[in-house]
């Protein structure tokens, strides 16, 4: 056979679908690899061919589109399962070709099982809600294209094993789940089950997402430097180890980049010759506020080092702050034996 542009196995599209549920999978060629869509390709006389490799097999085989009740079918650039079976797991290839052109891509499809509380190996999308922010909604994801707008599905929402009913602050509203006022107790996994009829059969779509309640922008503040501060003086003798922590609190801000850095005499530590190391640790509160600590360390400090300016800087989308550490050389303690002796007139 003639050469074919092979885009290989597109592992970025690790598609997971639930066993015994409908699944519609678009050929990735038109979404990620080619500059034209299926309609254009079809008009130009190109044909879309599907085949697959079963899990733990090397042999590519055609997809059987003659199964009872059209369990697997193709419609335009979509491969349909009505419904999936566990042994549909494998690598699927869609190939677009005519006599002069060929392009193909493979992608993994994993059919996963769920238990009665919707636990499964499925990777879950995370939806962040602001704490105590007023009404916020999540929407049952990835159900478009499964049934026509004339069909009115029934939607049931669950939190874990439990149907969402009579909850204090969570109200199911069809495809949406409304949080009247999101609290930490609303953290968790929420599942919508969409039930719809098709050709005398009933199908279910199960979609689970994780809700994480995070700090509200109403309460967000610029970075707060807790250390260094005016109450602590780093007093050292030459030869001792100098350790200065820079501890900064960042309010949660969606898509904000939190940064902490030290300057020594106005320069980044990498740009100066002294032997300095910086270790960073990060911790998060339950609402994803962040505390970053960068410890500046000089193993054997010199008297010149103790005259330098050590400034901790922090920046987020809310602003930039800086604070200098109070560093000084320890004054040697008086040597009492000599000085007291001198005081008593000894020679």
């Amino acid at each position: 056979s003639e050469r074919c542009d092979d885009w290989g196995l597109d592992t970025m599209r690790q598609i997971q679908v639930f066993e015994d549920e409908p699944a519609r999978i678009k050929c990735p060629l038109f979404e990620h690899f080619l500059k034209f869509n299926y309609s254009t390709a079809h008009s130009a006389g190109l044909t879309l061919i599907w085949y697959w490799t079963r899990q733990d097999r090397d042999l590519e085989e055609p997809i059987n589109f003659r199964l009872p009740e059209n369990r697997i079918s193709k419609e335009k650039d979509v491969l349909w399962f009505r419904p999936t079976l566990l042994n549909d797991t494998g690598n699927y290839t869609c190939m677009l070709r005519n006599t002069t052109y060929c392009s193909k891509v493979a992608f993994p499809l994993e059919v996963v099982q769920k238990d009665s509380c919707f636990n499964s190996p499925m990777k879950l999308p995370v939806h962040k809600l602001y704490i105590e922010y007023g009404i916020q909604r999540i929407t049952c994801p990835n159900v478009d294209g499964y049934f026509p707008s004339s069909v009115k599905p029934t939607i049931t929402w669950y939190m874990g094993c439990y149907k969402i009913q009579n909850f204090n602050n969570v109200i199911p509203e069809g495809m949406n789940l409304s949080f009247l006022i999101a609290l930490i107790s609303n953290n968790g996994n929420y599942t919508c089950v969409v039930t719809y009829p098709e050709n005398g059969r009933t199908f279910h779509l199960t979609r689970t997402l994780t809700v994480k309640v995070v700090g509200s922008p109403k309460n967000a503040v610029p970075p707060v430097i807790h250390s260094p501060n005016d109450h602590v003086v780093y007093e050292k003798e030459p030869g001792e180890e100098l350790l200065i922590p820079c501890t900064v609190y960042f309010s949660f801000l969606m898509d904000s980049r939190n940064e902490v850095w030290w300057t020594i005499d106005g320069k980044k530590p990498d740009d100066i010759t002294i032997d300095v190391t910086i270790n960073e640790s990060i911790s998060h509160s339950r609402t994803e506020d962040e505390t970053r600590t960068q410890i500046l360390s000089i193993k054997k400090v010199t008297s010149e080092d103790l005259k330098r300016s050590y400034v901790c800087h922090a920046r987020s989308a809310k602003g930039e702050v800086a604070k200098a550490a109070k560093v000084k050389q320890k004054v040697p303690a008086p040597r009492y034996t000599v000085e007291l002796a001198c005081g008593f007139g000894a020679t």
Partner: antibody, heavy 122, light 107 residues
């Protein structure tokens, strides 16, 4: 170690109500459900309903709808089951039970209270 | 609602022998089945969930099997403390329902 401690035995007249309490110790940080199950003398187990104290969600078995009310007081980690319009066939041991989380399939009855005997007699 | 039927109602077994208890669901419950043990005057205790997974602290002589509508609890070698009533429970569909119980007594 999580424990459920229930209120003491009750003797009630037909037509009256009973309210049984179930106090949890060592509650986990994440939401959980309290289930109520009853067992008539020499009979099997019968699920009555549940409540999720931190979220307020509840549901009742069809058989008990209109007669049972399950509530919870989060501040005292106590759940309550009230059954009204009592009749002699409501004579049973009433149990509360719970799991560690809302997500553990098959483990929603991990921990049980010691049971409360309710006798309905004229 | 799903009806759970246990058999036999009573099982007479000698200590050290194997006991096999059955539970049938009126419709498929997949593997969403639990087994409980209840001794006189005590609350039930979770033994098995997910049809075959032993709960924490349950001895290995207890094992569960089955899926769909037919389930079995096996006690490989009965100890004196195993004589009790055993209940199965499905949690595939609401309302969660229990079987009527099997009493395992000393032969």
């Amino acid at each position: 170690q999580v424990q459920l401690v229930q209120s003491g035995a009750e003797v009630k007249k037909p037509g009256s109500s009973v309210k049984v309490s179930c106090k949890a110790s060592g509650s986990p940080a994440e939401p959980y459900a309290i289930q109520w199950v009853r067992q008539a003398p020499g009979q099997g187990l019968e699920w009555m309903g549940y409540i999720i104290p931190s979220l307020g969600g509840y549901d009742y078995a069809q058989k008990f709808q209109g007669r049972v009310t399950i509530t919870a007081d989060e501040s005292t980690s106590t759940a309550y089951m009230e059954l009204s319009s009592l009749r002699s066939e409501d004579t049973a041991v009433y149990y509360c039970a719970r799991g560690q989380t809302l997500y553990a399939a098959g483990r929603q009855f991990d921990i049980w209270g010691q049971g409360t005997l309710v006798t309905v007699s004229s | 609602e799903i009806v759970m039927t246990q058999s036999p109602a009573t099982l007479s077994v000698s200590p050290g022998e194997r006991a096999t208890l059955s539970c049938r669901a009126s419709q498929s419950v997949s593997s969403n089945l639990a087994w409980y043990q209840q001794k006189p005057g005590q609350a039930p205790r979770l033994l098995i969930y997910g049809a075959s997974t032993r709960a924490t602290g349950i001895p290995a002589r207890f094992s569960g099997s089955g899926s769909g509508t037919e389930f079995t609890l096996t006690i490989s070698s009965l100890q004196s403390e195993d004589f009790a009533v055993y209940y199965c429970q499905q949690y595939n569909n609401w309302p969660w329902t229990f079987g009527q119980g099997t009493k395992v007594e000393i032969k």
